[in-house]
């Protein structure tokens, strides 16, 4: 079954290569377990950046790996991607699945364009 997911259109990564945005989905309804997947679209290629399942009742950090961190609160998920470089610029799509209990719902946002600008190297000092 279909479900709406919303995310910002554009986000600028920090000079340290960190970008954060909120992915909000229609409603968790009776869902106890929700799976959130971050996808990166480059041309016709779609690759999974990170994914995790969290329990709605927790409202805690649910994702903590080298690439992504995530916290949840109700039907909002705050996603942070780390270690971005200029070549990481692209469209990042938030996919939300209401996994359990049934019925299964899935929603995909329209994507957030993340712009990454590599910092200028410091000039040599004499």
């Amino acid at each position: 079954k279909g479900m709406h997911a919303a995310q910002p259109a554009v986000v600028l990564a920090s000079s340290r290569g960190v970008a954060s945005f909120v992915c909000e989905y229609g409603s968790s309804g009776n869902a106890a377990e929700v799976r959130v997947t971050m996808l990166r679209q480059a041309g016709s290629q779609m690759t999974e950046v990170c994914a995790a399942t969290y329990t709605v009742e927790d409202e805690l950090a649910f994702l903590d790996d080298s690439t992504c961190t995530g916290t949840s609160s109700g039907n909002k998920v705050n996603l942070t991607i780390q270690g971005l470089r200029a070549m990481g610029t692209g469209l990042y799509i938030c996919k939300v699945e209401l996994m359990y209990p049934p019925p299964y719902y899935v929603g995909m946002g329209n994507g957030t364009q993340i712009y990454v600008i590599d910092p200028e190297p410091c000039p040599d000092s004499d």
Partner: antibody
């Protein structure tokens, strides 16, 4: 504090009908699915039905399809079980129970007796 | 429908001794997301059931660590490492993976 309070249990003649109620309090009713579970005297637990309180979508155990109807009134935070064509073997304590991974709650039960 | 078969029907255990209850499902109860929603309940006379274990092996808050759950696929076990007088009651397994959800028939634990 979460509370589930069942009511409506009674003595009913075979073939009769009855509606049980379960009033929920202390939490957002539409965030959790709700079950009816019954227990005949001296017997085990039997899952009857479940409703997604957000969508209203019901699911039944095969034994109860057609005779029993689970429903809810979100404005009243109340779960219902409408029982028709009652039989002696429907005599039981009926529990409402909140479906949850971490925080399940059960009511104290209400007793239905079907006898002539 | 998935049938949950519990054994034994009853057991009598002395305080301090271990107890083990088996629950077998008629087919796999692994849900489509990879989780297994197998739960254990305890019911004391005249009371509503109380959940002890969820998702096979996770103890519900406040449940003593004497209680443990294990298993996978179709075979599951509830163990009590050292039985206490307060543990007397009927124990039920429950599968919430595949609708219609179903309970096992129950195992009565009596303390000698």
């Amino acid at each position: 504090e979460v509370q589930l309070v069942e009511s409506g249990g009674d003595l009913v003649k075979p073939g009769g009908s009855l509606r049980l109620s379960c009033v929920a309090s202390g939490y957002t009713f539409t965030n959790y699915g709700m079950n009816w579970v019954r227990q005949a005297p001296g017997k085990g637990l039997q899952w009857v039905a479940w409703i997604n309180t957000y969508t209203g979508e019901p699911t039944y155990a095969d034994d109860f399809k057609g005779r029993f109807t689970i429903s809810r009134d979100n404005a009243k935070n109340t779960l219902y079980l409408q029982m028709n064509s009652l039989r002696a073997e429907d005599t039981a304590v009926y529990y409402c129970a909140r479906r949850s991974i971490y925080y399940p709650y059960w009511g104290q039960g209400t007793t239905l007796t079907v006898s002539s | 429908d998935i049938v949950m078969t519990q054994t034994p029907l009853s057991l009598s255990v002395s305080p301090g001794e271990p107890a083990s209850i088996s629950c077998r499902s008629s087919q796999s109860i692994v849900y489509s997301n990879g989780n297994t929603y197998l739960e254990w309940f305890q019911q004391k006379p005249g009371q509503s059931p109380q959940r002890l274990i969820y998702k096979v092996s996770n103890r519900f808050s406040g449940v003593p660590d004497r209680f443990s759950g294990s298993g996978s696929g179709t075979d599951f076990t509830l163990r009590i490492s050292r039985v206490e007088a307060d543990d007397a009651g009927v124990y039920y397994c429950f599968q919430g993976s595949h609708v219609p959800w179903t309970f096992g028939g129950g195992t009565k634990l009596e303390i000698k």
